[in-house]
Interface confidence: low
């Protein structure tokens, strides 16, 4: 014992002066604590603690349960202890069957011995089953058996403390180890939908699913840039021992425009945190926005196909869609479909398929769509490009030669003179008069052009060519001249 200088308080002394004492069941335990400032005896074993204010602790008939640590404390808080074993062949173990282990930590199987002289103090599996190969333990007769570094796989492991007594193995009552898992990853969080679009007054409800190894994971819904506590409801399940799931449902019963924003589901455990967000947009009323996927002014060649395509956003869902031409509604040749199968999709596509367009089918094609709140429309102006057609080619009474041609875009008419029997008419003749006849008519039909030249300018036999052309193609008509003397005997028009 360390020497104590005079005046300095010293710990109490205990009789008998030994650290351990072994008595037989039924014998007397007599412990004397000597100290001028005696305060109390304290007895501890397992979960039990008892106190005695007498300086002599006497137990007349010792029982196995009197095994434990007896501590004498003085008024200076200094203490001394003796450990008493009450040897009872019928009760070799004192047990506290409460057995929890935290993963990766040590845990104590509390089965202290009443007889320190038994041998082979160890752990055994229940019903003769072997213990896990990697289970390591350290026995301590006064405390129990320490399992080192508890594994998750030991959860619900059934075991006994065991000793050998007179050559036989004696088992304690059974213990069942309950392992509390350590967090080795952040929680897994997911949200029912990444975005919500609602009208004022509608209910907003979103569910966050949190998965982790135990229910001690923390979770909450937060509004970004706000400290307001949100009202949420929970459901939770244990799918097996280390597979916990919680559903946290956030509800705003009547959403307002200023409820719009980003909501975060946040979860954390001792390993770290995770979050997932959902976006809420609340509008005062529904809307439809149409986006043409091609130019709204369309030029197409005669006989070719064209697809008029629009994308549109509609909220709430579109209820009526139609394509109209010349006050007539298409019953076929068009299709309307959602841009994605996503539940929160608000974008749709509508396509009108125009096939082998004729020159007479130019005009305004209109797409109309409506939902419960609004209507919207978009118009396409379709122009059909046609090769010029010469409608008439005549010699007028006044001696003029006149050519009338129709087509789109507006045809240009050129005149050529071919002397004699020449096949190639190359000398161009300037027209006297050119008129676009239907410029005030409907804007999408063929354009009609009339051009005239004075036939008196021709003094020789030959052919006059009227050539009408545009971007699509060309067409010609011919006038033949034959002179007899000074008179033009014949003018034969032909194409």
């Amino acid at each position: 014992q360390p020497s104590v200088s005079p005046g300095e308080p010293s710990p109490p002394s205990i009789h008998p002066g030994k650290s351990d004492l072994i008595v037989r069941v039924g014998d007397e335990i007599r412990l004397l604590c000597t100290d001028p400032g005696f305060v109390k005896w304290t007895f501890e074993i397992l979960d039990e603690t008892n106190e005695n204010k007498q300086n002599e602790w006497i137990t007349e008939k010792a029982e196995a349960t009197n095994t434990g640590k007896y501590t004498c404390t003085n008024k200076h808080g200094l203490s001394n202890s003796i450990y008493v074993f009450v040897r009872d062949p019928a009760k070799l173990f004192l047990v506290d069957r409460s057995l929890y282990g935290k993963e990766d930590n040590d845990t104590l199987v509390r089965c202290p011995l009443t007889d320190p002289e038994v041998t082979n103090y160890s752990l055994k599996g229940c019903q003769g089953k072997p213990l896990p190969k990697d289970l390591r333990f350290i026995p301590d007769p006064k405390a129990g058996i320490m399992i080192k570094s508890v594994k998750r796989a030991y959860h619900r492991l059934c075991l006994h403390c065991s000793v050998d007594q007179e050559g036989k193995s004696v088992l304690s009552e059974k213990f069942i180890l309950k392992v509390r898992p350590a967090f080795k990853a952040v929680p897994v969080v997911s949200v029912s939908k990444a975005s919500y679009l609602l009208r004022e007054g509608e209910e907003f409800t979103v569910t966050c699913t949190i998965k982790d190894v135990s229910s001690s994971v923390y979770s909450t819904w937060k509004r970004e840039n706000s400290q307001t506590k949100l009202q949420e409801k929970y459901n939770s399940w244990h799918h097996g021992d280390f597979n916990y799931e919680r559903q946290a449902t956030l509800t705003i019963s009547s959403a307002r425009v200023n409820d719009s924003g980003v909501f975060m589901c946040y979860a954390n455990n001792t390993f770290g945190s995770a979050n997932v967000t959902t976006t809420l947009e609340v509008v005062d009323k529904g809307f439809i926005n149409i986006f043409p996927m091609i130019n709204t002014t369309v030029f197409v060649n005669d006989g070719e196909n064209v697809d008029l395509i629009v994308e549109y956003e509609a909220f709430p869902k579109p209820e009526h869609q139609q394509w109209i031409y010349m006050n007539r509604t298409f019953t076929d040749k068009w299709e309307d479909y959602p841009k994605s199968e996503n539940e929160s999709n608000i974008r749709y596509v509508s396509e009108l398929h125009l096939t082998r367009l004729k020159g007479t089918e130019g005009g305004t094609y209109t797409f109309l769509v409506s939902n419960s709140d609004v209507n919207a429309a978009i118009a396409f102006n379709v122009y059909v490009n046609t090769k010029p057609e010469i409608l008439t080619y005549d010699r007028l009474v006044n001696g003029m030669l006149q050519c009338v041609a129709a087509g789109f875009p507006e045809p240009t008419i050129d005149w050529y003179f071919c002397p004699g029997t020449e096949q190639r008419c190359s000398a161009s003749v300037l027209p006297v008069d050119v008129q676009t006849l239907n410029s005030s008519g409907p804007p999408f039909g063929k354009l009609v052009v009339q051009s005239s030249i004075d036939s008196s300018a021709f003094k020789h036999n030959g052919t006059v060519e009227c050539k009408a052309y545009n971007d699509v193609g060309k067409t010609s008509a011919y006038f033949n001249f034959a002179f007899k003397g000074n008179n033009k005997e014949q003018i034969h028009p032909h194409t």
């Epitope: 397992l46 979960d47 039990e48 603690t49 506290d96 069957r97 409460s98 929890y100 935290k102 930590n105 509390r110 619900r156 069942i176 309950k178 509390r180 135990s214 229910s215 001690s216 939770s236 399940w237 244990h238 916990y244």
Partner: antibody, heavy 123, light 107 residues
Framework: QVQLVQSGAAVKKPGESLKISCKGS????????IGWVRQMPGKGLEWMGI????????RYSPSFQGQVTISAGKSISTAYLQWSSLKASDTAMYYC????????????????WGQGTMVTVSS | AIQLTQSPSSLSASVGDRVTITCRAS??????LAWYQQKPGKAPKLLIY???SLESGVPSRFSGSGSGTDFTLTISSLQPEDFATYYC?????????FGGGTKVEIK
């Protein structure tokens, strides 16, 4: 003998904070879970959460998560239940209780109960 | 969360009567069920744990039975001190939950 002794009744205003206590004696405090149970006036029992004082591992009921904090001082064998901002709806009797032994591999029933702490929140 | 439904919610009985209270779980909870007695102004008291084990110091007229989803608390011969409210509680999985209670009154 084994017992849990709770702190006295508390009267508070909405928005105030509060911490109530539960002191264990007569057993090894660090080796048993301590739970908290709420009983609103005229109503049934509601489990709030538990703590293992040995390492302060806590489990909360989802209904109370984020509303209260459970803690423990193992050196003084005391568990705590606290609120940072009380509401009128927090008015209730609060009991602490010890998880006894369940021999079937589960955490056990509440075998020892405190006497209860009445919390009244009123403006 | 596991829901516990107690029935009846209240009953009237006389001293000496045999009283049975049932507790039904929304999913299987093995035998992880306890029964408590609570008198007005007092803390609850544990009667039965692990569905059928009698807590130390509780009179033998109290018994529990059942496993899985259906459980019963029986008082074989009702005594004057037994008039109280009785609660079941599951401790199979978190969150731990209580039944709504059964009030036993004097007829």
């Amino acid at each position: 003998q084994v017992q849990l002794v709770q702190s006295g009744a508390a009267v508070k205003k909405p928005g105030e904070s509060l911490k109530i206590s539960c002191k264990g004696s007569g057993y090894r405090f660090t080796s048993y879970w301590i739970g908290w149970v709420r009983q609103m006036p005229g109503k049934g029992l509601e489990w709030m959460g538990i703590i293992y004082p040995g390492d302060s591992d806590t489990r909360y009921s989802p209904s109370f998560q984020g509303q209260v904090t459970i803690s423990a001082g193992k050196s003084i064998s005391t568990a705590y239940l606290q609120w940072s901002s009380l509401k009128a709806s927090d008015t209730a009797m609060y009991y602490c209780a010890r998880h006894g032994r369940g021999y079937n591999g589960y955490d056990g029933a509440f075998d020892i109960w405190g006497q209860g702490t009445m919390v009244t929140v009123s403006s | 969360a596991i829901q516990l439904t107690q029935s009846p919610s209240s009953l009237s009985a006389s001293v000496g009567d045999r009283v049975t209270i049932t507790c039904r779980a929304s999913q299987g909870i093995s035998s992880a069920l306890a029964w408590y007695q609570q008198k007005p102004g007092k803390a609850p008291k544990l009667l039965i744990y692990d569905a059928s084990s009698l807590e130390s110091g509780v009179p033998s007229r109290f018994s529990g039975s059942g496993s899985g989803t259906d459980f019963t608390l029986t008082i074989s011969s009702l005594q004057p001190e037994d008039f109280a409210t009785y609660y079941c509680q599951q401790f199979n999985s978190y969150p731990l939950t209580f039944g709504g209670g059964t009030k036993v009154e004097i007829k």
